[in-house]
Amino acid sequence: EPPTACREKQYLINSQCCSLCQPGQKLVSDCTEFTETECLPCSESEFLDTWNRETRCHQHKYCDPNLGLRVQQKGTSETDTICTCEEGLHCMSESCESCVPHRSCLPGFGVKQIATGVSDTICEPCPVGFFSNVSSAFEKCRPWTSCETKDLVVQQAGTNKTDVVCGPQDRQR
């Protein structure tokens, strides 16, 4: 009785169960009554990452420097190449096919999370008591100067973009 379903790591063809090719190898010939499935290793620039019956291996991803990409992890016969972005850039999408410069946080905003090769800068508005007067991809909101600790008084209130201005206390006569 020919099988209608096969075990794990097998496939059904010509009414018989054949072994799938292991990761890193492609199918050359299906099994027969006399021989097991024939598989061959993927070439150096190719890979297959699952048990398969593919007749062609997949090409490793190319990390194009013109798109700001570099190799984070070299591909093997069983894994694809992993690309990441050059310093100062991050991936445009999850598949990381190209890179864009990290955004800077404008004055009034500080860096909540510094960008990585795969994620952009996350900015946050400076809360009361903090300010940022620069456009930066690294600077957090800085606290206003404490005039009191310097034995000074506030002459000009701070904003989210400016620090307080301290001055000497008025002398009492």
Epitope: S29, T32, E33, F34, T35, E36, L40
Partner: antibody, heavy 113, light 108 residues
């Protein structure tokens, strides 16, 4: 009826090459791999390799890499095995077989000066 | 590579006698891919039994096969004069495919 027709005996000089044909009939040539097997006089059988006529990919026994080259001509349903740099060690009967189920009658190759 | 060792290498039997030839593999083989061939002098090998125990078309029922893992056998229930030949086991489980050294069967 499946038939594999091989050529007659070959007498070749040491260092020369020989190309043995195996003409298939009675089935769709591209449906089955063709295997090649060596049998030295009074000895057992040795698998040389096989070729898939569908994709022209051949797989070799490591022992025969560089010695044997397998090819096919789909238009004439013929498989070929070329043996090169022949020595007396290559004197043997060579069989083609359709995945071991059907065998050719064999071709005797004698290497002698 | 998988080495197949056959025993005996040669044997002589009387007509009507029961014959058993064994084939031992150096590592385990899927029973789906162990086969037996008969070769008569001056002829090509002919499939006798495929996939351990399946009789090839036109082969007399006195031939049978069994086994699993690394141990396989071919049995001739009652020897006949026409069974004089060399018998080979072969594995198609892993490349390179290999054959046993052969068992030459003669008649007493």
């Amino acid at each position: 009826e499946v038939q594999l027709q091989q050529s007659g005996p070959e007498l070749v000089k040491p260092g020369a090459s020989v190309k043995i044909p195996c003409k298939a009939s009675g089935y769709t040539f591209t449906d089955y791999n063709m295997d090649w097997v060596k049998q030295s006089h009074g000895k057992s059988l040795e698998w040389i390799g096989d070729i898939n006529p569908n994709n022209d990919i051949s797989i070799y026994n490591q022992k025969f890499r560089g010695k044997a080259t397998l090819t096919v001509d789909k238009s004439s349903s013929t498989a070929y095995m070329e043996l090169r740099s022949l020595t007396s060690e290559d004197t043997a009967v060579y069989y083609c077989a359709r995945r071991f189920a059907y065998w050719g009658q064999g071709t005797l190759v004698t290497v002698s000066a | 590579e998988i080495v197949l060792t056959q025993s005996p290498t040669t044997m002589a039997a009387s007509p009507g006698e029961k014959i058993t030839i064994t084939c031992s593999a150096s590592s385990s083989i899927s029973s789906n891919y162990l086969h037996w061939y008969q070769q008569k002098p001056g002829s090509s090998p002919k499939v006798l039994i495929y996939r351990t125990s399946n009789l090839a078309s036109g082969v007399p029922v006195r031939f049978s096969g069994s086994g699993s893992g690394t141990s396989y056998s071919l049995t001739i229930g009652t020897m006949e004069a026409e069974d004089v030949a060399t018998y080979y086991c072969q594995q198609g489980s892993s490349i390179p495919y290999t054959f046993g050294g052969g068992t030459k069967l003669e008649i007493k």
